[in-house]
């Protein structure tokens, strides 16, 4: 019951996290203009991974997409890549985890298979969360390094005077959404990995066997097979003694008055 709850909760937490990563990636407020001590205008500028927007006090908003890949900073491309990889891994992880859920029965899927799928999805969620956290952190670092004090250096440029005002940009809402979402996905992944341990069947040292009594007296050693979870060292299926004892896998025993099961 606890395993099912842990797995289910891990799935839900990861689902929320991945939804958050998608939302953060699509949001325009990755960097927002610091309006304090801004000598330029009262028009608010905020930028995302895909476009730049200006919003006026009247409520009018205009957004323009970054039209070229060549003119964009390499770091922005890296952030885009990290976020997309995070989303893709998270989406695959969700797909795998749906089939791995203990509360969902698909044909005659064994617990060991579900355990494997739970572990796989858990690892995918962890990597997805780390990608999102890394992407957001790289962008945040870009913001910190670009957080110049507003300067107005007048110089004569091509075609006229250019007043260079390095407007300060600060952390936008998308960064916080991304960090939280990445964290949730990471936590969800860890929960799935924990649930996986509970799903794996325990190793047992017994197996049902049928043996055929031979004419002469035979010493019988049980324990011909050892059940394996698939995670530990897979014990070799060795015959202990061949004096009439057979496991069910080795030979089909025919009904006889001497058969004991």
């Amino acid at each position: 019951m606890a395993v099912t709850a842990c797995q289910g909760l891990g799935f839900v937490v990861s689902l929320i996290g991945i939804a958050g990563i998608i939302a953060a990636t699509c949001m325009d407020q990755w960097s927002t203009q610091d309006l304090y001590n801004n000598p330029v205008t009262a028009v608010f500028n905020y930028q995302g991974l895909w476009r730049s927007c200006v919003r006026e006090s009247s409520g009018f908003t205009e957004c323009r997409g970054y039209f070229t890949l060549l003119g964009l900073p390499a770091m922005l491309q890296a952030v885009r890549a990290l976020m997309i990889v995070g989303i893709v891994l998270g989406a695959i992880g969700l797909l795998v985890s749906i089939f791995a859920l203990k509360c969902i029965r698909i044909g005659s899927m064994e617990d060991s298979a579900k355990a494997n799928m739970t572990l796989t999805s858990g690892i995918m969620f962890i990597v997805s969360g780390l990608c999102a956290i890394a992407g957001v952190s790289v962008f945040a670092n870009m913001l910190v390094t670009n957080f110049w004090m507003s300067t107005a250096n007048m110089y004569t440029g091509m075609g006229g005077m250019v007043q260079t005002v390095q407007t300060r940009y600060t952390f936008g809402a998308a960064l916080f959404v991304g960090w939280v979402a990445g964290g949730l996905t990471l936590i969800g992944g860890v929960m799935m990995c924990i649930a996986c341990r509970g799903l794996a069947p325990e190793e047992t040292n017994y197996k049902a066997v049928s043996y055929h009594a031979s004419g002469h007296s035979v010493a019988y050693k049980p324990g011909g097979f050892k059940a394996s979870t698939g995670f530990g060292s897979n014990t070799k299926n060795k015959k202990i003694y061949d004096g009439g004892a057979r496991t069910e896998d080795e030979v089909q025993s025919y009904p006889s008055k001497h058969d004991y099961v």
């Epitope: 330029v40 930028q47 009018f60 970054y66 003119g71 922005l76 870009m142 260079t164 005002v165």
Partner: nanobody, 120 residues
Framework: EVQLVESGGGLVQAGGSLRLSCVAS????????MAWFRQTPGKQRELVAG???????NYADSAKGRFTISRDNAKKTIYLQMDSLKPEDTAVYYC??????????????WGQGTQVTVSS
């Protein structure tokens, strides 16, 4: 590099009209604000009129009722229609643009100016 090119200046009689235009070119994402400033010898550059992307306008007291600023966002151009010109309107008129050129890049650019002379 962003360039602002003004045109339309010249010599005009008092009471006459002129239409100035300014076109922005180069790598531009957004132009939150475009404005006209003027400067007379020995004086500070002063705002004449400004217009935002959304069309919100702002005029200097001396320009209200006589000057009209308009904007064509698609052409990245602003216009200043100057009517009922007075000799005190004589100045070099500069185009100004607040331009977002890229990620975390927002600069203010100036044109080279166009001379407007109003004779009495």
């Amino acid at each position: 590099e962003v360039q602002l090119v003004e045109s339309g200046g010249g010599l005009v009689q008092a009471g006459g009209s002129l239409r100035l235009s300014c076109v922005a070119s180069g790598t531009i994402l957004n132009i939150p604000l475009m404005a006209w400033f003027r400067q007379t010898p020995g004086k500070q550059r002063e705002l004449v009129a400004g217009i935002t992307t959304g069309g919100t306008t702002n005029y200097a007291d001396s320009a209200k009722g006589r000057f009209t600023i308009s904007r064509d966002n698609a052409k990245k151009t602003i216009y200043l229609q100057m009517d009922s010109l007075k000799p005190e309107d004589t100045a070099v008129y500069y185009c100004n643009a607040d331009v977002v050129t890229g990620l975390m890049r927002r600069n203010v650019y100036w044109g080279q100016g166009t001379q407007v002379t109003v004779s009495s």
